[in-house]
Amino acid sequence: ATKLTEEKYELKEGQTLDVKCDYTLEKFASSQKAWQIIRDGEMPKTLACTERPSKNSHPVQVGRIILEDYHDHGLLRVRMVNLQVEDSGLYQCVIYQPPKEPHMLFDRIRLVVTKGFSGTPGSNENSTQNVYKIPPTTTKALCPLYTSPRTVTQAPPKSTADVSTPDSEINLTNVTDIIRVPVFN
């Protein structure tokens, strides 16, 4: 069975979060996709969405968020550039499918942004997380206002955390520290 999980990214201010959400391309290739933040006790808030219908590998930029939907691969790429401490939180990708509720994608992203000079020689931030180049064309898309009332808005209690990093090289990748945590619905 598919497990809903969280992956934790610990980044410094100014860095770029660069992640992907996969979906069943036969079902959702041209559906509108969105990037949402889930704040404790609140409804998920849509921060950016693709066009409707979603265009293949056509970057959409909303502020510091860039979405790129690779239809033919069933992948939505999400980049949040120039991260700020206030960006810390729980994020998810969803697929809009009116009149039905949005379809939530795996995995959720727990983003922790800390203050600190990024890209110092010898630090573990010497990676593509620092680097961002603006796509040649960007467009803004209007996002539907509705969100799913049934979306879980609480992080799992600390006791359920299952830090699955059996092979220690995950901490040596310079991507970030990523912790996988099952979320129980």
Partner: antibody
Amino acid sequence: QVQLVQSGAEVKKPGASVKVSCKASGYTFTSYDINWVRQATGQGLEWMGWMNPNSGNSGSVKKFRDRVTMTRNTSISTAYMELSSLRSEDTAVYYCVRLIGYSSAWKWSFQHWGQGTLVTVSS
Amino acid sequence: DIQMTQSPSSLSASVGDRVTITCQASRDISKYLNWYQQKPGKAPKLQIYDASNLETGVPSRFSGSGSGTDFTFTISSLQPEDIATYYCQHYDNIPITFGQGTRLEIK
């Protein structure tokens, strides 16, 4: 340690299908995408596509899209790549590969490779 | 699709030599570039990721540099065990593509 062990060499006739298996050990199978890369004899590397073992979703490059199927059995930590309508130019070594970072990261660095499976297509 | 062009396609060098392989992308790929080493009959091995980061366990004589469209892979002092074919690979977008490879031989 991380290990990807692939099934043995196959000889197939043109038009047939082949299913290559890739058994993972030494890590949580559902936490990392599996990719497939092939290499024709004496040629370079060619990326075929990816699969997320947790969701079961997969994607492949255009030239293989109608012929390739990537699946998995999470209970035995095994990924599969099936290629149908084989032709002589599909003769190659097929590798399953695990990425460096967890499946949500845009980090397509091929860190752990299977030993390869030679598929020969000949009439 | 992004084309990756490696040069030279083959080179011969002596033990102790400094060896440089270049990889050029058909458009800006930032630092989304990896380098692999493949010995005959073996699977490739990741050597450098994100243009300049040395993979764990890879000797420090190997290094990578560059960003945008031009990248360099360097072996500071060639050793007999470095004889292999080296490939670059981008992941700036989908599809992922590899360079055609550079075959390195000992003089």
